[in-house]
């Protein structure tokens, strides 16, 4: 064991180092002093530290620790923040395209309905966006409102075009008649099921990502306790009091200290692991009716089918509504020609053929793979921080908190620390209140993720027809339908590529009376590409 510096030695080196921490030298003794007032760097002989210096070291140690923690989580934080933003934007783009397809369907097939239909469709998709972002809207109510609003217009414009304008007075009765007579058949129920399942999953996916950010932010900004500050000071700075400026802490000692300081944070580990695995399970189930992209982009077709259903039953319906809403029937129902098959302007759905294919679903899977590389993030934190702060290689000739040692022995170090500081006590205190809160939030989201009514594997496919979700098979396994009947069916392979490379972004909102031609928005396309290949240090 090297002897303490001789009493006549100056504290010159310590002074110059401390000067960098705290300009002004009034706290540093000229020569070593007994240091009887020290509480952390308890001297075995004369020391170059004062009580004020010790306090400054503690403050610096805690700040260092916070910075180390922030740099440790920077990559993970960036990964989740960026993906949360990308997916939110992607979902909004899907909603906008779905709205535009639906408006295009009305414009091309039912021009007499367009002004009002655009309004109702717009309100519906606004509600869809709000729901995804967490608004307290009921999906069934949204769908009911859409069909309740559409029916009076269909009735007065399509089924009874000769009715006087005053017939709009019976709107309220027609809205109700829509449900009483089930005028759209089972289509509203079908849409409710598909939209609610897909949006619920989408919403919880975004919720989970945002909670991930909150977890990282919480642990990122943890304030370390005074006890931890003392331990860190003893590890990083007490050697300076003995003039040992170049000595590094022992690696094993660093691990012990970090585990003590991070005992509360490490408790998140179990719930963090479960969070990533539950999120993976959710993502694996996001296809077919659980994939909002697939469902929303096919809505225009289902709505078209529902209007055709009304038209096929128009004669009978007009008679019954005459009774229910008591308007005088001046004319027999006469159906104008309406095409059987869905007509969609080919300009709208021109798909570019490209080599590179990236979809929302592949993007989700990619995110999960990256997140899985951070599955041990919290349990690995103490080791990570030690490996990113100066420690002695191989635990030889290193500082153990009290003295320079040839080889670090955990037992000896613990014994030596017993009277100064109880590590066990620190662990027993339990996590900080903020950590407890974030653990509760993780438990909650994990439960939500687990209880989502998601299909297990590909079992869902067998049940589709029983539940009436999809009629007819769309061929290849990886293809999804967004089409209705006959030749009007459009097959879409990998929807997001299809979205990103739409040759025309039909935005009916922007130009209700024009030919609806618009070029794709470059920023929308780029949104879905290149997050960069982030590699995790905490594998």
């Amino acid at each position: 064991q090297p002897p303490p510096p001789p009493p006549d030695a100056t504290c010159h080196q310590v002074r110059s180092f401390f000067q960098r921490l705290q300009p002004g030298l009034k706290w540093v003794p000229e020569t070593p002093v007994p240091g009887s007032d020290l509480q952390v760097c308890l001297p075995k002989g004369p020391t170059c530290c004062s009580r004020k210096m010790e306090e400054k070291y503690q403050l610096t140690a805690r700040l260092n620790m916070e910075q180390l923690l922030q740099s440790a989580s920077m990559e993970l934080k960036f990964l989740i923040i960026q993906n949360a933003a990308v997916f939110q934007e992607a979902f909004e783009i899907v909603v906008r395209h779905a709205k535009n397809y639906t408006n295009a369907m009305f414009k091309n097939n039912y021009p007499s309905l367009t002004p009002q239909a655009f309004e109702f469709v717009g309100e519906f998709f606004t509600d869809v966006s709000l729901y995804i972002l967490g608004s307290d809207i009921n999906v069934d109510d949204m769908v009911n409102e859409l069909f309740d609003s559409l029916f009076p217009v269909i009735y007065t414009q399509l089924m009874n075009p000769g009715l006087p304008d005053s017939a709009l007075d019976i709107n309220e009765c027609l809205r109700g008649a829509r449900r009483d007579l089930k005028v759209f058949g089972n289509f509203p129920k079908l849409i409710m099921t598909q939209v609610s399942k897909s949006l619920q999953v989408t919403r919880i996916f975004l919720q989970a990502l945002n909670l991930g950010i909150e977890v990282i932010n919480t642990t990122d900004h943890l304030k370390f306790s005074k006890d931890c500050g003392r331990m860190l000071t003893r590890m990083w700075y007490c050697s300076y009091c003995q003039g040992l400026m170049m000595v590094k802490p022992c690696g094993g000692y660093c691990n012990v200290v970090m585990q003590g300081c991070m005992a509360g944070v490490v408790e998140i580990d179990k719930y963090w692991r479960e969070y990533i695995l539950s999120l993976e399970e959710l993502v694996n189930g996001m296809y077919r009716i659980y994939d909002m992209e697939n469902v929303l982009l096919g809505l225009f077709s289902t709505i078209h089918d529902s209007i055709q259903y009304v038209q096929k039953n128009a004669g009978k319906l007009t008679t019954t509504i005459g009774k229910l809403c008591a308007h005088s029937q001046q004319r027999q129902y006469r159906s104008a020609y309406y095409p059987e098959d869905l007509f969609i302007d080919k300009k709208v759905l021109k798909v570019a053929h490209v080599e590179h294919e990236e979809t929302l679903s592949s993007r989700r899977r990619e995110l999960i793979q990256k997140l899985k590389s951070f599955i041990s993030f919290y349990s690995a934190l103490p080791g990570y921080i030690c490996s990113h702060s100066p420690v002695a290689e191989n635990d030889t000739l290193c500082w153990n908190g009290q003295e320079l040692v040839e080889r670090y022995s955990q037992k000896a170090a613990r014994n030596g620390m017993k009277n100064q500081f109880n590590l066990h006590e620190l662990k027993m205190k339990g996590p900080e209140p903020v950590v407890s809160q974030i653990i509760d939030k993780l438990k909650h989201i994990n439960q939500l993720l687990r209880t989502m009514s998601m299909p297990k594997g590909r079992v869902l496919d067998k049940n589709l027809d029983e539940e009436g979700f999809e009629s007819g098979d769309c061929g290849d396994d990886e293809d999804e339908c967004i089409g209705g009947s006959g030749d009007g069916m459009i097959k879409v392979k990998n929807q997001l590529r299809f979205l990103a490379e739409l040759a025309y972004d039909l935005d009916v909102d922007d130009a209700p009376g024009n030919s609806q031609q618009a070029t794709p928005k470059d920023n929308e396309i780029s949104t879905f590409h290149n997050l960069g290949n982030v590699h995790s240090p905490l594998k």
């Epitope: 005053s166 009765c173 008649a177 009483d180 007579l181 809403c325 008591a326 308007h327 005088s328």
Partner: antibody
Framework: QVQLVQSGAEVKKPGASVKVSCKAS????????ISWVRQTPGQGLEWMGW????????NYAQKLQGRVTMTTDTSTSTAYMELSSLRSEDTAVYYC??????????WGQGTLVTVSS | QPVLTQPPSVSVAPGKTARITCGGN??????VHWYQQKPGQAPVLVIY???DRPSGIPERFSGSNSGNTATLTISRVEAGDEADYYC???????????FGTGTKVTVL
């Protein structure tokens, strides 16, 4: 807010007629129908019929056909129900109710009609 | 004209759940509405179109309808829920509006 205010209680002799009024406010009168429902003491609800405020079309319950007449005055947003040839079993509280499609979403406070010799 | 059958009475302890049924042939194919009537007052619509709640009606009230039975469910029952409850449908074949026999809910 939507309100339906009915006329006051009536006491009638058997064979006489009674006319109950129902004044609507707080909504577009012609956009809804007005239905009439009665409730005999200690008994359930019985639908009597309805009238479209939009065009005056009526639909009466079979058992009251010929004895009941429903009318509206759109200028005052008022509906009327007249029941003739009263008998003791017509003693009841008579309600007017705003008719949506097949549901009655707002009700008047009720009018007690007592038929007694 | 359909007959809608309801149990004459249902008793329930406060905080518990009350279920009132309305039976009718293939009632699931019709829209069912429910009314609450407190003594000396006019009926109030509490559920329409099987399961929708008008504004102002607490979430504790819910409805369902399938097969031959429609059900009104009152969860976390309160003393103020004590009333008569009626179901109602529109019969398209006779073009008549039919009320159920009524159920008296007593809160113990």
């Amino acid at each position: 807010q939507v309100q339906l205010v009915q006329s006051g209680a009536e006491v009638k002799k058997p064979g006489a007629s009674v006319k109950v009024s129902c004044k609507a406010s707080g909504y577009t009168f012609t956009s809804y129908g007005i239905s009439w429902v009665r409730q005999t003491p200690g008994q359930g609800l019985e639908w009597m019929g309805w009238i479209s405020a939009y065009n005056g079309n009526t639909n009466y319950a079979q058992k009251l056909q010929g004895r009941v007449t429903m009318t509206t005055d759109t200028s005052t947003s008022t509906a009327y129900m007249e029941l003739s040839s009263l008998r003791s079993e017509d003693t009841a509280v008579y309600y007017c109710a705003r008719k949506g499609s097949s549901q009655f979403d707002q009700w008047g406070q009720g009018t007690l009609v007592t038929v007694s010799s | 004209q359909p007959v809608l059958t309801q149990p004459p009475s249902v008793s329930v302890a406060p905080g518990k759940t009350a279920r009132i049924t309305c039976g009718g042939n293939n009632i699931g194919s019709k829209s069912v509405h429910w009314y609450q009537q407190k003594p000396g007052q006019a009926p109030v619509l509490v559920i329409y179109y099987d399961s929708d709640r008008p504004s102002g009606i607490p979430e504790r009230f819910s409805g369902s309808n399938s097969g031959n039975t429609a059900t009104l469910t009152i969860s976390r029952v309160e003393a103020g829920d004590e009333a008569d409850y009626y179901c109602q449908v529109w019969d398209s074949s006779s073009d008549h509006y039919v009320f159920g026999t009524g159920t008296k809910v007593t809160v113990l």
